[in-house]
């Protein structure tokens, strides 16, 4: 409807930059609406260029608010079923006319991008998009070309007679596998891609194609050189050669055919319908996804985009599947969150890339003062008294194995166990029998102590027990503290990582 300066933006801006007359072109590009970025390089659903553009000449004092726009519609033919959700990219290009170094100059004035949801066959949807100081008012709709029907422009299909297969020469219908394509009633030889029919023996051409069998592409511009003018309604006939013949893309651009026209994939630093423009500056924000634009300070110098992690392409328009590089070690699950990469580690592994093997004594240690013992490619915990399990996390009953001999009573204690010996027995496990007459303790006292005074012997044994218990307790305390510190460090890191992963997946 209109393209011009937005409201409240001061003096209306001329698109011609006071360099003489210019024309505006609009390039409409449709992309699948599945990606967050909607900026994959090719217009996979189709692209088209406005034609019949009036010349705009700036006159002193004239308002630039209502610029002459291309006549009629911009039609974008799409070959496959209509996806319903899509990304609409509209670029406004200025062609500077008149005496100019190197002929006409092209500049991208504005680019608007937006995801849309639209069923085919519905009414016109209106939209206003602002970019910089420009405002674009436009309407859009999706319409099926017969024989396609419905909100998704599915091909005309009919139910299968037999559930397993379609009739001779008929294929399953792509959107509806339980249906078959209707038998062709078109003129023999009518192009299945570019032609259709509503009556038997008819061949009607889709937009962009002409000829009795709809096999000849129509030029989008006025006839050049040897190209033969066709009927008034069909534009120009291109006999034989395809739209990419002779490579219309300049500056090393690569050409691909799209719906009878062509599209140039331009190298970085170049823009335009034929990659002929390097007039986009960094201030225009040509790098998608937050990419850093370098160079391109003026329209004559090319720019380069330095892409954020996870993006590539000359304009950072393509998302990279960084998980395909398998960065997570030891079987970790890779999650590409766009702005970050996260690894969800298997049990027994930790670290940003699951690089720490916790089944290794260098990784996580044993809990509660247990000692890590490696062997045979795995590790085992030798647990302190009172603890058991794989990591010494389970409390064990030290009295379960009945360690007190000769009827001694066992008491569980924080540092292990204590035996209360029956009368006539002594020792840590009540293993020594004490003779009632104060003679030798039997049977296990060391040889050198057998002839000694029993009271001295008892005092010696108790002193040894006390020293051993104190040493064990001190050792356990030191080990527990150091292990807890190491455990806390790993657990904190793991909890933080899981929290981040949860947060970022939600974001």
């Amino acid at each position: 409807h209109s393209f011009g300066p937005g409201p409240g933006l001061g003096t209306p801006r001329s698109p011609c930059n006071a360099r003489g007359p210019c024309r505006l072109f609009f390039r409409v590009c449709l992309k699948p609406g599945v990606s967050q970025e909607a900026t994959e390089s090719l217009c996979a659903l189709g692209a088209a260029l406005s034609t019949s553009v009036p010349v705009y000449t700036e006159h002193p004092g004239e308002s630039a608010a209502a610029l002459p726009l291309p006549d009629g519609l911009v039609r974008v033919p799409f070959r496959d079923a209509w996806p319903g959700t899509f990304s609409l990219v509209i670029e406004t290009w200025r062609e500077q006319l008149g005496e100019h170094a190197g002929g006409p100059a092209w500049n991208l004035l504005a680019r608007v991008v937006g995801r849309r949801r639209l069923a085919a066959g519905g009414p016109w949807a209106r939209d206003v998009q602002r970019t910089g100081t420009w405002e674009l008012h436009f309407s859009y709709r999706a319409r099926c070309e017969p024989p396609a029907v419905g909100a998704a422009c599915a091909r005309l299909c009919r139910s299968r007679s037999a559930p397993s297969r379609c009739g001779p020469g008929l294929r399953p219908c792509t959107p509806f596998p339980d249906e078959c394509e209707a038998p062709s009633v078109c003129r023999p030889g009518c192009s299945p891609e570019h032609g259709y029919c509503e009556e038997p023996d008819e061949c009607r051409c889709l937009e962009g194609w002409t000829g009795p069998l709809c096999t000849v592409p129509v030029s989008t511009s006025s006839c050049l050189n040897s190209r033969v003018p066709g009927p008034a309604s069909t534009g120009c006939l291109l006999p034989g050669p395809g739209p990419c013949d002779g490579n219309p893309c300049a500056n090393g651009g690569s050409c691909s055919e799209t719906s009878g026209s062509f599209e140039c994939a331009c190298p970085r630093g170049f823009y335009g319908l034929r990659c002929e423009v390097s007039g986009v500056t960094c201030a225009d924000g040509p790098c998608f996804n937050g990419g850093l634009c370098v160079g391109g300070e003026d329209p004559d110098s090319a720019y380069v985009c330095h892409c954020p992690p996870g993006f590539q392409g000359s304009n950072c328009e393509k998302r990279v599947d960084r998980c395909s590089l398998q960065p997570c070690q030891n079987g970790g699950l890779c999650l590409d969150l766009g702005h970050a990469l996260r690894c969800r580690c298997r049990a027994g592994f930790a670290g940003p890339r699951c690089e720490h093997d916790l089944d290794d004594c260098a990784g996580r240690a044993c809990a509660n003062g247990g000692t890590c013992v490696e062997g045979g490619g795995s590790r085992r915990c030798s647990c302190a008294l009172g603890f058991g399990g794989r990591d010494c996390r389970e409390r064990a009953d030290p009295c379960a194995s009945r360690p007190c001999a000769h009827g001694g009573r066992c008491y569980a204690h924080f540092s292990g166990l204590v035996c209360a010996c029956a009368p006539g027995y002594m020792g840590v496990r009540c293993e020594f029998a004490v003779r009632p007459d104060g003679a030798d303790a039997v049977p296990a006292a060391p040889r050198g102590l057998r002839q000694a005074d029993p009271q001295r012997f008892l005092a010696g044994v108790i002193a040894v027990i006390v020293v051993v218990v104190i040493a064990i307790v001190a050792g356990i305390v030191v080990l527990v503290i150091s292990r807890k510190k190491r455990m806390a460090k790993y657990e904190k890191a793991e909890i933080k990582e899981m929290g981040e992963m949860h947060r970022e997946l939600n974001a």
Epitope: S87, G132, A283, G285, P286, C287, P308
Partner: antibody
Framework: EVQLVESGGGLVKPGGSLRLSCAAS????????MNWVRQAPEKGLEWVGQ??????????HYAESVKGRFTISREDSKNTVYLQMNSLKTEDTAVYYC????????WGQGTTVTVSS | NIVLTQSPATLSLSPGERATLSCKAS??????VSWFQQKPGQSPRLLIY???NRYTGIPARFSGSGSGTDFTLTISSLEPEDFAVYYC?????????FGGGTKVEIK
């Protein structure tokens, strides 16, 4: 010439609110991700948050320290990005800069926010 | 978040001398490191991106190097206008984080 101009800073009591603005000129604003970065007195730089483009549904991301208290929005028609700061704390005292892109290429001159009782 | 540690905190040098600033990351950040310069009362300015690439308009005396966890900013011959605070920033993992800064002062 690219210019980013922040405004809206000032003195506010703890628990109070403030709205900062950043007006851009010389760039096609709607094509740029916008960030807020702050710098506490005599301290280093800290990223605060980010807002992306219309084509990204104006997705926002925030630093943990401000999540739930600060909100970033943008008005492409006015070439302006905003930082709404609620439940302000003394530790939010800083110079606040707006900056563009993922790599913080263009920076504004900053606006000072002081949170004090 | 990834932590960046800059050293030294202060570097006292004379004009014409070579300045070497270090930045260490707590984990691998590839080459996604930038260096910023901040003069008193001014906003930061991007100098180096991608660890070693000079940004538009930055003089050739500034160079960056490193990858993984260790990065260096070198000013080959200090000019009077180079005395400022320099920050490294990592852009490998979201959110972006900055080092504590190195102040390059006149000796």
């Amino acid at each position: 010439e690219v210019q980013l101009v922040e405004s809206g800073g000032g003195l506010v009591k703890p628990g109070g609110s403030l709205r900062l603005s950043c007006a851009a000129s010389g760039i096609t604003f709607s094509n740029f991700w916008m960030n807020w970065v702050r710098q506490a007195p005599e301290k280093g730089l800290e990223w605060v948050g980010q807002i992306r483009l219309k084509s990204d549904d104006y997705a926002t991301h925030y630093a943990e320290s401000v999540k739930g208290r600060f909100t970033i929005s943008r008005e492409d028609s006015k070439n302006t990005v905003y930082l709404q700061m609620n439940s302000l704390k003394t530790e939010d005292t800083a110079v606040y800069y707006c900056t563009t892109g993922y790599y913080f290429d263009y920076w504004g001159q900053g606006t000072t926010v002081t949170v004090s009782s | 978040n990834i932590v960046l540690t800059q050293s030294p905190a202060t570097l006292s040098l004379s004009p014409g001398e070579r300045a070497t600033l270090s930045c260490k990351a707590s984990e691998n950040v590839g080459t996604y490191v930038s260096w910023f310069q901040q003069k008193p009362g001014q906003s930061p300015r991007l100098l180096i991106y991608g660890a070693s690439n000079r940004y538009t308009g930055i003089p050739a005396r500034f160079s960056g190097s490193g990858s993984g966890t260790d990065f260096t900013l070198t000013i080959s011959s200090l000019e009077p206008e180079d005395f400022a605070v320099y920050y490294c920033g990592q852009f490998y993992s979201f959110p972006s984080t900055f080092g504590g800064g190195t102040k390059v002062e006149i000796k």
